[in-house]
Structure formats: C-alpha cells, structure tokens
Interface confidence: low
C-alpha cells in the first residue's frame, strides 16, 4: 500500500515537472489515473478478504478432516483388534475342529480295522467249517469203503503234495513205529525230495525222528519200495557209518532225522519220534 502511495506521489511530481515544461496538464488524464489507483486498491482489498475467507475455510476444513482422520484411525484400530480376535477365535475353533476330525478319523480307522479283522476271522471260520464238512464227508466215504480208497487226509493228519502225514508226540523204537503206521493204513515217512524234506522239518522241530529207511536186511531200502540209490538223500557228513561204538550190540540199521533235519543211521532199538505217511487216492 505504501508503494502505491509513493507511486501516486511520484505521479504528482512528474505532473508538476510536465507543467513546468509544457504548460497546464489535461484534466481528464489526471482523473483517469486517480480512478485507476482506487480500483487497484479495491481489487487488492477484495483479494485479501477473499484470501482470508479461503484460509479460514481451509483451516476449518482441515480441522474437520483431522477429526475425521482420527475417527477413521480409531475405527480402523478397533476393526483390526476385532478382526484379530475373530481370526484367533476362528483359529482356535479350527484347531478344535481339526482335533475332532482326527479323533473321528482314528475312530473310523479303528472301526474299519476291526470290521476287516472280523471279516477275515469270519472268512477263516467259514473256510474251516467248509473244510471240516468236506473232511467229515470224506471220512464217512472212507469209512463206508472200509478205508480201501482215500481221497482226503484223516483227522489230525497234515496234507502235503498228495500225501497225508502224521507226526508223533511220543517215542518208540523203529520197528514199533513202523507197526503203528501200518495199523493206520500208512507207513513210516519216505522222503523223496528237498521240498518234502523242508515241509517235514517245518513240522518236526529239532527232534530225532524215525523215517522209513532201513538196511536191516542188507542194502538200504525205503519201506514203500521207492528206489534208494537213485532217489533223494540227505545224510549227515560221514553217514551212514553203521557205528558199533555205542555199546548196545550190533551196528546201526535204521535211519532218522537228526536235530538239523539231515539223516543219520542209528540203533533201531532207540526210542525216537516218528512220522507216518499215506498217499491220497488219485480221485482227489
């Protein structure tokens, strides 16, 4: 404002200067300039007031915005806490549900296992029942046929590869054991292969057990006539030796399984366990 005023002063001085040089100044121009100066002042004042109003409005709005921001922040903070709580609650519920599901799962698995076991057990019983019925009807047929034909193994005998085997739990000398088997329409076991040997071993355990092999009448012979020389043999090393050193009189004329399954010749009067064998009829 001061500057404007100075300008006016300057204009006046200038006018005086012109007056001195050129004579009296034209009156309309001076009035025009004066009018122009007051308009500028008015404009300047208006702008200042407008600026003040704008500043006030902006300050007011800023204050409102700040309050709104604070409110938003508070709301967001509350929302975050609330959301966290909900997430925690859901997580806890999830864990609980997971545990319950695992519990249900394990219960179901156990029930399924039990059912499977029951089913297996039932199948086994059915199979056994069928086997028993078949065996019984077979025994009846054998009984009616006076034992001349046999298409199944007698009760308590074990079937293997078309033969029936009976394993003693008592002991007898070789001759007595052979007699027992004959009374059962069978004979002392004749071992014809490694497979049969293994089968017999599985059922006997490590026990001395008589077999149907003897040389009491000269050469070694199987009781059922199977050829000894060309057949399966499983002697212990250096056996048979017809040893006389036992002090029981005579040599050793009867064969038996030793504790590891291989054969040895021994005194026939020794009491050992024995195995009877009978062939099944071809009709089976």
């Amino acid at each position: 404002m001061t500057k404007d005023y100075q300008d006016f002063q300057h204009l006046d001085n200038d006018n005086d200067h012109h007056q001195l040089r050129r004579g009296p100044p034209p009156t309309p121009r001076l009035l025009q300039r004066l009018c122009s100066g007051s308009r500028l002042l008015l404009l300047s004042s208006s702008l200042s007031i407008l600026l003040l109003v704008v500043v006030c409005v902006i300050t007011s709005q800023n204050s409102q915005l700040r309050e709104d921001l604070l409110a938003l922040r508070q709301n967001f903070s509350n929302l975050t806490v609330s959301t966290e709580d909900q997430v925690k609650a859901l997580s806890t519920q999830g864990s609980s549900v997971g545990r319950k599901m695992k519990l249900v799962e394990s219960k179901l698995e156990k029930q399924q296992k039990d059912l499977t076991e029951d089913h297996s057990s039932l199948l086994l019983h059915v199979k056994q029942l069928v086997s028993d019925v078949r065996s019984l009807s077979c025994q009846m047929a054998a009984f009616r046929g006076n034992g001349s034909e046999r298409t199944c193994c007698p009760i308590n005998w074990v079937e293997y590869e078309g033969s029936c085997y009976w394993f003693s739990s008592s002991v007898r000398p070789w001759t007595e054991a052979d007699k027992y088997c004959q009374l059962e329409n069978a004979h002392l076991v004749v071992v014809t292969s490694r497979d049969e040997q293994n089968f017999l071993q599985r059922h006997m355990g490590p026990l001395n057990t008589w077999i149907g092999l003897t040389d009491q009448n000269g050469p070694w012979k199987w009781v059922d006539g199977t050829d000894y020389e060309t057949g399966f043999q499983n002697w212990r090393p250096e056996q048979p030796d017809n040893w006389y050193g036992h002090g029981l009189g005579g040599g050793e004329d009867c064969a038996h399984f030793t504790t590891d399954g291989r054969w040895n010749d021994d005194v026939c009067r020794r009491p050992y366990r024995w195995v009877c064998e009978t062939k099944l009829d071809k009709a089976n």
Epitope: P206, L207, N208, R236, T258, T259, D260, G261, N264
Partner: nanobody, 121 residues
Framework: EVQLLESGGGLVQPGGSLRLSCAAS????????MAWVRQAPGKGLEWVSW????????YYADSVKGRFTISRDNSKNTLYLQMNSLRAEDTAVYYC??????????????WGQGTLVTVSS
Amino acid sequence: EVQLLESGGGLVQPGGSLRLSCAASGFTFDGYDMAWVRQAPGKGLEWVSWISGDGLNTYYADSVKGRFTISRDNSKNTLYLQMNSLRAEDTAVYYCAKQYDYESAWRFDYWGQGTLVTVSS
C-alpha cells in the same frame, strides 16, 4: 579242554533287554548244536532255546517265543541269546550248553558256569 564262558547278565527293569554271550573253546564249534538252559531261584532246569550247528535251525520254549532270539557266530566260536521284553519270571541263572552228540537234541555234555539275569523294578 572244552570251555564255555557266559557273559552279559545283570540287573534289568521289566520290559528291558539284555544280550548274553557264550565264548566256546576246546572243540569244533560248528560241528555241534548248542542251547541255552536256565534255572530260576529254587526251581529246576528249564530249557530255553536251541540252535543247530550251522545256525539254520532254531527252537524256543513257549515261554520265550517271540521275545528271545538265539544265534551263533561260528567264525568267532560264540553263541548269543538276545532277550527282549524281559519279565520278572525270566530271572534266573542262564547256562550255555554243548550238545552231547548230534543225535541227541536235549542231551548236553558240557555246561558253562552260568550268568545271572535279574529282572526287577
């Protein structure tokens, strides 16, 4: 001279394990079947387990089946008895025994001095 020396006995809690060893000398070890026999305090001898000379065949008393394992290392002339899931009734002196001859599964001509196994909590 035939000698059998057991070791590995001791005090063990029920459910625990022990491994007994029997070092043999003075005879052709792999030519004979071997066995473990035990004697509980105030009781008679009880056969526990048997193994053939080649180690291929083994046999166990019903009371130890599934818990004890007999084995042998013929290159080291040693017999073993691995005892798992031990019970109080397994408390006894354990002897290793050499079979009398290959024809007699349960006859023994030489015994060790025994090793005491005590199962107690």
